[in-house]
């Protein structure tokens, strides 16, 4: 059945890299240039993709690959194989529909992408506020109230960098 | 096959204006919302102006009240008029298409321009 197929089917002795030309009686031709084939047997050569304006080219397209993109200083890859480039924001802010806008109060993101988290809300453990949250940092928990023993000296925060706030209750 | 094409640039003094064009072709420009960026050799590219197909706009916070983007879509064109030039607007400036109507957000499927220079000097 292999050797029927095969004599059926002379596309399928064609390498990646190369296509089945029907246009010259079925022999394998090489992919043009900017077009690739990945796999044995292919008809037609896939275009290969372009890493233009805020992507960059990571990886050039060979007869037998794709090229792969990655994104300019400034910018991060969202979605599979680099798909998106989205603009990169400071710490304490985060990418909205009119571009990056500081964290609201009671929220911070400490990476220059994703979004605005809400502060922990250390009562929820039983817990107490040792530091306090920015823009940029997550509160951070100390011992309850309960924890700390009569006449036992508190740790005193360090003075914040910047807005402080509270965990909201 | 798509093509985007930006002319206009050139030699302008501070507080100098210029009109950018971006002449489009290849695909349904009137449904399509496009975008203009820039590129400072060194640093990287930003977003400058983004318009969608009816015509609604967004600035960066850099070039709002100096720059306008608009569209004709009867001749398949988007602009950019730059007015009160400073320095720090000299730049290659591109036009692309803008399919994830995102701010600062651009897929792989968009489409970009060569680029125009435009250089701002006393």
């Known amino acids: 059945f292999e050797r029927t197929r095969s004599l059926q089917d002379p596309c399928s002795n064609c390498p990646a890299g190369t296509f089945c030309d029907n246009n010259r009686n079925q022999i394998c031709s090489p992919c043009p240039p900017n077009s690739f084939s990945s796999a044995g047997g292919q008809r037609t050569c896939d275009i290969c993709r372009q890493c233009k304006g805020v992507f960059r080219t990571r990886k050039e397209c060979s007869s037998t690959s794709n090229a792969e993109c990655d994104c300019t200083p400034g910018f991060h890859c969202l979605g599979a194989g680099c798909s998106m480039c989205e603009q990169d924001c400071k710490q304490g802010q985060e990418l909205t529909k009119k571009g990056c806008k500081d964290c609201c109060f009671g929220t911070f993101n400490d990476q220059k992408r994703g979004i605005c988290r809400p502060w922990t809300n250390c009562s929820l453990d039983g817990k107490s506020v040792l530091v306090n949250g920015t823009k940029e940092r997550d509160v951070v928990c100390g011992p309850s109230p309960a924890d700390l023993s009569p006449g036992a000296s508190s740790v005193t925060p360090p003075a914040p960098a910047r807005e402080p706030g509270h965990s909201p209750q | 096959e798509v093509q985007l094409v930006e002319s206009g640039g050139g030699l302008v003094q501070p507080g100098g204006s210029l009109r950018l064009s971006c002449a489009a072709s290849g695909f349904t420009f009137s449904s399509s919302a496009m975008s203009w960026a820039r590129q400072v050799p060194g640093k990287g590219f930003e977003w400058v102006a983004y318009?969608?197909?009816?015509?609604?706009?967004y600035y960066a916070d850099s070039v709002k009240g100096r720059f306008t983007i608009s569209r004709d879509n009867a001749k398949d064109t988007v602009y950019l008029h730059m007015n009160s030039l400073k320095f720090e607007d000299m730049a290659v400036y591109y036009c692309?298409?803008?399919?994830?109507?995102?701010?600062?957000?651009?897929?792989?499927?968009?489409?970009w321009g060569q680029g125009t220079q435009v250089t701002v000097s006393s």
């Open positions: 318009i969608y197909s009816d015509g609604s706009t």
């Open positions: 692309a298409t803008w399919r994830s109507q995102q701010v600062g957000r651009w897929d792989e499927y968009d489409h």
